[in-house]
């Protein structure tokens, strides 16, 4: 006999990276008939929602109107049907950005390289941080971690046309509190025409996660898109 219900899905809309003082919605999708959902934050109960009517709703949304460093961290949710509770969802890492300062991103030997060349990004931030994050724009938001007192280097190795795209970096004050994003650096990788045509910027995930993040940054608009990013989420753990 089943002792627990299947775990729900959890994600953040429009993005798990939230500029401070902006809003974010945490979504939890369980089953029709669930009478209560609980959102937990760092192991403590954060919020409760009781859908009405439960038999017609399988997803709830928890609204955070004013993101700050106290609310950055790991979230999970559970739901209840009758007296039976579900397994907890996977962890959602909610990150607050635009904290303190703006790093500088540079690339060596330069932003225009030939396929096969070795490329290194440098992210510099003079304030107290030792962890840096390099993100490539696009749905998959490829994230790399680097460490250093005021600067981290991110060697990409011999590049291919798949490395083409726009990069930004963050300084990280802890796993869930990041600086303002750096100015973007666009990497152009030239190769033979055949390869170039077969290598769009981000072939696996064409939807633009970064665009959604920028929309949040600039206007605070909410978008009803499930853009939770597994690549970056896993890297945070």
């Amino acid at each position: 006999q089943q002792q627990t219900l299947p775990k729900p899905f959890i994600w953040a809309e429009p993005h798990f990276m939230v500029p401070k003082e902006k809003q974010v919605t945490i979504c939890c999708q369980g089953n029709y008939g669930a009478v209560e959902y609980q959102l937990h934050f760092e192991g403590s109960l954060f919020a409760v929602d009781r859908p009405k009517p439960p038999e017609r709703i399988n997803k709830v949304k928890f609204y955070i109107p004013d993101m700050n460093s106290r609310m950055a961290g790991q979230y999970s949710c559970i739901y209840r049907v009758g007296e039976l509770w579900s397994e907890p969802s996977n962890l959602l890492d909610l990150v607050v950005t635009e904290m303190y300062d703006t790093p500088t991103l540079s690339v060596h030997p330069g932003p225009e390289v030939i396929s096969g060349e070795k490329v290194t990004f440098y992210c510099r931030l003079d304030t107290a941080t030792s962890m840096f994050l390099l993100l490539k724009e696009g749905r998959s938001s490829h994230v790399q971690r680097g460490y250093g007192k005021v600067q981290a280097e991110f060697p990409l190795g011999p590049v291919t046309t798949a490395h083409r795209g726009t990069y930004r970096c963050f300084g990280s004050y802890n796993n869930h509190a990041w600086s303002f994003p750096s100015e973007p650096v666009k990497l152009l990788v030239t190769g033979d025409i055949e390869n170039t045509s077969l290598a769009p910027e981000d072939p696996t995930f064409p939807a633009d996660t970064w665009g959604t993040y920028l929309l949040t940054t600039e206007t605070g608009l909410q978008k009803d898109h499930a853009l939770w990013d597994h690549t970056a989420q896993n890297l945070l753990r």
Epitope: D49, K52, M71
Partner: nanobody
Framework: EVQLVESGGGEVQPGGSLRLSCAAS????????MGWFRQAPGKEREFVAA????????YYADSVKGRFTISRDNAKNTVYLQMSSLRAEDTAVYYC????????????????????WGQGTLVTVKP
Amino acid sequence: EVQLVESGGGEVQPGGSLRLSCAASGRTFASAAMGWFRQAPGKEREFVAAISRSVGDTYYADSVKGRFTISRDNAKNTVYLQMSSLRAEDTAVYYCAAVVPTYGNNIYVHSAAYNYWGQGTLVTVKP
């Protein structure tokens, strides 16, 4: 901007009752989830009770369940905390808090979620 003003605190004997009120200014009260927290001398602020924006769903700390009742009157922009069977351990400064705006059924338990706070009202329970 939301301003919250608590009232109704005072001294009461064990087993007695009090009703706290929290008056909210501004037109946003109907879109606010509300909560009560308390802080006893030398202790951390703790959750007491909360109520959702629209349907009036409620949630209580185990320590007050069955003794305290939270309610709201959207016409009066006021949230109430009816406290009965009071005990010495209920002695604390009671704070009203709001999350504005929010979805209809959300009930917030964690203090970090609340973006507006009142100044507090003191409740003392002693013989």
